[in-house]
C-alpha cells in the first residue's frame, strides 16, 4: 500500500472485477498504521484516526489489528491485500462491509483482526458481533 | 463497466424544489461513499456533498452554499443516489454530476435551471 | 474550507510550448492535491493525485509538483487535444474544494 498522505484515484481502464463481474474499485480507509489505544472492554470502539486514504490497488480492503500486552494497547489501521497474509494470517472476512474482530492466537499478547470491503469500515471496529451500531453505550477511542 | 447515470434535471422557479437521481451499476454501490458535484455555465466545479455508507450509519455533509436547503440519501437496493434540492436559487443552476466519491468516475451529468 | 487559487486564469500556447500552471491553497495540504482536465461539455477527467503521481492513461508530458501550499502543473510538449480548462483539487479536507480554473487555449 501506499503512505497513508498519499491519495490515489484510479483510472476506467484499470479494471479489476470480483466474482460477479462487479468492478472493484479502490476503497477509502482509515490509514494510521499503529497507535496506542485506549479500546478496552468494549463491543465498538471508533479508530480515531483521522487519515482517510485511497488504497493504492482496486482489490486492497481495509483492515484493523487490535493487540494488547503488558505494557499498552494498539490499535492499526491499513490497506491491505485480502491474497497476501497479514501478520501471518488470511482475511478470511474481507468481503464483510463491517470490521467484525475476531481473536488470533499470538504468544505474550491478547491479538484481534478484522478487514471488510466498504468505504472506511475499519473506523468502527467491533468486538461483537450482535453490536447494534446505535447501542448508547458506544465509547470512543482517545489516542494518547 | 462502470456507469453513473444522473438524471432529473430540468427547470424550476425561484424557491422551488427538485429531486436528482443517479443509477448506479458496474461496482459494489453499498460500499461507497458517493458525492455531487456541480458547474455553473461557464464557471469552475463546485463540490455540493457526500454521502457515506449505509452500514457506517449514512452520515452526509455538504458545501455551505447548499448546506439546510439540500439532502443527499441514497437507496442500496435500488443502487441509486439522490439529491433533493429545496428553496433554490438561482444561483444553484449548474449542471449537477454523480460522482464515485474522491475517485476517477463521473457521470454525464444533469443541467439544472433555476429561473422565473 | 481550504481556498484554491490558480494562475493565470487563462493562457495562449502554441502546439510543441510548455505549459506551466500554479495552484496554491490558503493552508497546507500535504500532498492532496488533485489536477483535472475538462473539456466543454464533458465530465473532468483526473491527471494528477497526490500532487505528482500520474494517473494510468494519462501521457507523460503530463508531470505535477508541490506539498504544502505551492503546486504546479506541466505540460512539457503541449498537443492539440490538451487545449482545455485544468481544475487542481484539494483533498485533504471537507469540503473537498476546486481551484478557479485555468483555460488552455490555441495561440
Known amino acids: 500500500t501506499i503512505p497513508p498522505h498519499v491519495q490515489k484515484s484510479v483510472n476506467n481502464d484499470m479494471i479489476v472485477t470480483d466474482n460477479n463481474g462487479a468492478v472493484k474499485f479502490p476503497q477509502l480507509c482509515k490509514f494510521c498504521d499503529v497507535r496506542f489505544s485506549t479500546c478496552d472492554n468494549q463491543k465498538s470502539c471508533m479508530s480515531n484516526c483521522s487519515i482517510t486514504s485511497i488504497c493504492e490497488k482496486p482489490q486492497e480492503v481495509c483492515v484493523a489489528v487490535w493487540r494488547k500486552n503488558d505494557e499498552n494497547i494498539t490499535l492499526e489501521t491499513v490497506c491491505h491485500d485480502p491474497k497476501l497474509p497479514y501478520h501471518d494470517f488470511i482475511l478470511e472476512d474481507a468481503a464483510s462491509p463491517k470490521c467484525i474482530m475476531k481473536e488470533k492466537k499470538k504468544p505474550g499478547e491478547t491479538f484481534f483482526m478484522c478487514s471488510c470491503s466498504s468505504d472506511e469500515c475499519n473506523d468502527n471496529i467491533i468486538f461483537s458481533e450482535e453490536y447494534n451500531t446505535s447501542n448508547p453505550d458506544l465509547l470512543l477511542v482517545i489516542f494518547q | 463497466q462502470v456507469q453513473l447515470v444522473e438524471s432529473g434535471g430540468g427547470l424550476v422557479e425561484p424557491g422551488g424544489s427538485l429531486r436528482l437521481s443517479c443509477a448506479a451499476s458496474?461496482?459494489?454501490?453499498?460500499?461507497?461513499?458517493m458525492s455531487w458535484v456541480r458547474q455553473a455555465p461557464g464557471k469552475g466545479l463546485e463540490w455540493v456533498g457526500r454521502i457515506k455508507t449505509t452500514i457506517s450509519g449514512g452520515a452526509t455533509q455538504f458545501a455551505a452554499p447548499v448546506k439546510g436547503r439540500f439532502t443527499i440519501s441514497r437507496d442500496d437496493s435500488k443502487n441509486t443516489l439522490y439529491l433533493q434540492m429545496n428553496s433554490l436559487k438561482t444561483e444553484d443552476t449548474a449542471v449537477y454530476y454523480c460522482?464515485?466519491?474522491?475517485?476517477?468516475?463521473w457521470g454525464q451529468g444533469t443541467l439544472v435551471t433555476v429561473s422565473s | 474550507d481550504i481556498q484554491m487559487t490558480q494562475s493565470p486564469s487563462s493562457l495562449s500556447a502554441s502546439v510543441g510550448d510548455r505549459v506551466t500552471i500554479t495552484c496554491r491553497a490558503s493552508q497546507s495540504i500535504s500532498s492532496y492535491l488533485n489536477w483535472y482536465q475538462q473539456k466543454p461539455g464533458k465530465a473532468p477527467k483526473l491527471l494528477i493525485y497526490?500532487?505528482?503521481s500520474l494517473q494510468s492513461g494519462v501521457p507523460s508530458r503530463f508531470s505535477g509538483s508541490g506539498s504544502g501550499t505551492d503546486f504546479t502543473l506541466t505540460i512539457s510538449s503541449l498537443q492539440p487535444e490538451d487545449f482545455a480548462t485544468y481544475y487542481c483539487?484539494?483533498?485533504?479536507?471537507?469540503?473537498?474544494?476546486f481551484g478557479q480554473g485555468t483555460k488552455v487555449e490555441i495561440k
Open positions: 483539487q484539494q483533498s485533504y479536507s471537507t469540503p473537498p474544494t
Open positions: 497526490a500532487a505528482s
Open positions: 458496474g461496482f459494489k454501490f453499498s460500499n461507497a461513499w
Open positions: 460522482t464515485l466519491d474522491l475517485r476517477d468516475y
